[in-house]
C-alpha cells in the first residue's frame, strides 16, 4: 500500500503519500479552531507509470495507452485512497464544542 | 457534474471529462478482442483550482491551502468519478465469449 509505512521510508518519485502539516491559522486562515493548532493532513503526489498501483481497469488501460502513446496527455493521476477523520475543539461563545471532521487526513494513495 | 453534457460543450481548462477513443489493437496491442474494435474510454484532465468540484474535505482543505500557499506542490488532481463497464466479444478457439469489463469508461470527473 502507498501509505506512510512504505512511502515515508522510501525515496519515491512515483505516486506516494507525502507528509504535509497544515497550520489552521497560518495556512487556511481558520483562527477559530482552539485545538489542535494544526494537523498532519498529508497529500498524494508522484508519477503514475504503467501499472503503478492502478485503481481501476480504466486507469490500467490509460497507463498502458500512455506507455504505447507517450506523447499523449492522457495519464492516471496520484490521488488519495484511504482518509481518516480529525477531531477539533472550538468554542461557541464560552461553550466548548467537539466536532469530528470527516476525510481530513490522507492515509494512502492510488493511481486513478 | 463534470460529465460529457457539460465538458464536451464548454472549452474548459479546469478539471473536466476529455474525449479519448482507444483502438484495442493499435493503442493497447490487444489483438484478441473481436468486437468492438475500440471504444470511447474518455479521461479526466485539467487544473483543480480553489473549490473546483472538490471531492472530499481533504481536497477542499488542499485547494484552500494551495490558494494561500501558491508555491506549494500539494494540490488536488483531476480524476475519474463515475465509471461504466464495457461489453466485449472474443473467441476461445471457435467458442465466442462475451465478457463485461468493469470500470472501463469514464463518465465524469472530480478533483481529489
Amino acid at each position: 500500500a502507498l501509505d506512510a509505512a512504505y512511502c515515508f521510508r522510501n525515496v519515491q518519485d512515483n505516486c506516494c503519500l507525502r507528509p504535509l502539516y497544515i497550520d489552521f491559522k497560518r495556512d487556511l486562515g481558520w483562527k477559530w479552531i482552539h485545538e489542535p493548532k494544526g494537523y498532519n493532513a498529508n497529500f498524494c503526489a508522484g508519477a503514475c507509470p504503467y501499472l503503478w498501483s492502478s485503481d481501476t481497469q480504466h486507469s490500467r488501460v490509460l497507463s498502458l495507452y500512455n506507455t504505447i502513446n507517450p506523447e499523449a496527455s492522457a495519464s492516471p493521476c496520484c490521488v488519495s485512497q484511504d482518509l481518516e477523520p480529525l477531531t477539533i475543539l472550538y468554542y461557541i461563545g464560552k461553550t466548548p464544542k467537539i466536532e469530528q471532521l470527516s476525510n481530513m487526513i490522507v492515509k494512502s494513495c492510488k493511481c486513478s | 457534474a463534470l460529465d460529457a453534457a457539460y465538458c464536451f460543450r464548454n472549452v474548459q481548462d479546469n478539471c473536466c471529462l476529455r474525449p479519448l477513443y482507444i483502438d484495442f489493437k493499435r493503442d493497447l496491442g490487444w489483438k484478441w478482442i473481436h468486437e468492438p474494435k475500440g471504444y470511447n474510454a474518455n479521461f479526466c484532465a485539467g487544473a483543480c483550482p480553489y473549490l473546483w468540484s472538490s471531492d472530499t474535505q481533504h481536497s477542499r482543505v488542499l485547494s484552500l491551502y494551495n490558494t494561500i500557499n501558491p508555491e506549494a506542490s500539494a494540490s488536488p488532481c483531476c480524476v475519474s468519478q463515475d465509471l461504466e463497464p464495457l461489453t466485449i466479444l472474443y473467441y476461445i478457439g471457435k467458442t465466442p465469449k462475451i465478457e463485461q469489463l468493469s470500470n472501463m469508461i469514464v463518465k465524469s470527473c472530480k478533483c481529489s
Epitope: L28, G29, W30, K31, W32, Y90, Y91, I92, G93, K94, T95, K97, E99, L101 | Y50, L51, Q57, R60, V61, L64, T67
Partner: antibody, heavy 121, light 107 residues
C-alpha cells in the same frame, strides 16, 4: 471587494417555507462563518444562526431551532437560509452577514442587502 | 441568555456635538482578556455596518470620530463632532455567550 448579494423579496402563505440565498464574492467563502440575522418591521436585530461552509457545521439560536435550516454550496460560494412553518410573526427582512473570522461566534463585518419575507394568506 | 439594554432609546444631537450611547449586559461579556462587545450603525434603508470591534477597536474604514469603551457589563459608544450622516439606529452586540444577542437599538 467583498460582496454578499441576496435573493429578492418573497411573499409566502402561512405554513409554507421560504429559502433565501446569499451569493458571496471577493473573499474565500470557506474561511469564514456565515450568520443569518432577521429584523422585523420597526424592530431590532435577532440572530438566527450560523454555518461554516467548508464542512456545513451549524449553530442555531434555540428561538428558531427546528424551523430554520442553514446550508452552503461551496462550488458557487452561496449560503442559504430556509425557514419553515411560516407565520405572521416571521414577516421581516432577513440578512446574511459574514463573521469577522477570529471566533466561531463573532461580530459581523459584511452584510447582505437584506431580503424581505412577507407572510400573507 | 445575555440580555443587552441600550440607553437612551432615542437621541437627538446637534451637529458638531458629542453623542454617547450606553449598553449594559445582563452579565459580564469579558473572557480571555477581551470584551466581546461590538457596535453597529444601521442607516435608514440600509444594512447594519460594523463600527467598533471588541469594545474599543475601530473597524477599518470607519471615521475616528467613533470610539468605544467599557468592560464587564457596561459599555459606551461615543460619536464626537456629530454629522447629519451619522443619523440612524445604533446597536450593541455580544458574542461572549451563545446565543449571540443585540441591544434593542438607539435611534
Amino acid at each position: 471587494e467583498v460582496q454578499l448579494v441576496q435573493s429578492g423579496a418573497e411573499v409566502k402563505k402561512p405554513g409554507a417555507s421560504v429559502k433565501v440565498s446569499c451569493k458571496t464574492s471577493g473573499y474565500t467563502f470557506i474561511t469564514y462563518w456565515m450568520n443569518w440575522v432577521r429584523q422585523a418591521p420597526g424592530a431590532g436585530l435577532d440572530w438566527m444562526g450560523q454555518i461554516f461552509p467548508a464542512w456545513g457545521m451549524t449553530n442555531y439560536n434555540e428561538m428558531f431551532e427546528g424551523r430554520v435550516t442553514l446550508t452552503a454550496d461551496t462550488s458557487t460560494s452561496t449560503a442559504y437560509m430556509e425557514l419553515s412553518s411560516l407565520r405572521a410573526g416571521d414577516i421581516a427582512v432577513y440578512y446574511c452577514a459574514r463573521g469577522y473570522g477570529n471566533y466561531a461566534l463573532d461580530a459581523m463585518d459584511y452584510w447582505g442587502q437584506g431580503t424581505l419575507v412577507t407572510v400573507s394568506s | 441568555d445575555i440580555v443587552m439594554t441600550q440607553t437612551p432609546p432615542s437621541l437627538s444631537v446637534s451637529p458638531r456635538e458629542t453623542a454617547s450611547i450606553s449598553c449594559r449586559a445582563s452579565e459580564s461579556v469579558d473572557s480571555y482578556g477581551n470584551s466581546f462587545m461590538h457596535w453597529y450603525l444601521q442607516k435608514p434603508g440600509q444594512s447594519p455596518q460594523l463600527l467598533i470591534y471588541l469594545a474599543s477597536n475601530l473597524e477599518s474604514g470607519v471615521s475616528d470620530r467613533f470610539s468605544g469603551s467599557g468592560s464587564g457589563t457596561d459599555f459606551t459608544l461615543r460619536i464626537s463632532r456629530v454629522e447629519a450622516n451619522d443619523t440612524g439606529v445604533y446597536y450593541c452586540q455580544q458574542n461572549d455567550e451563545d446565543p449571540l444577542s443585540f441591544g434593542q437599538g438607539t435611534k
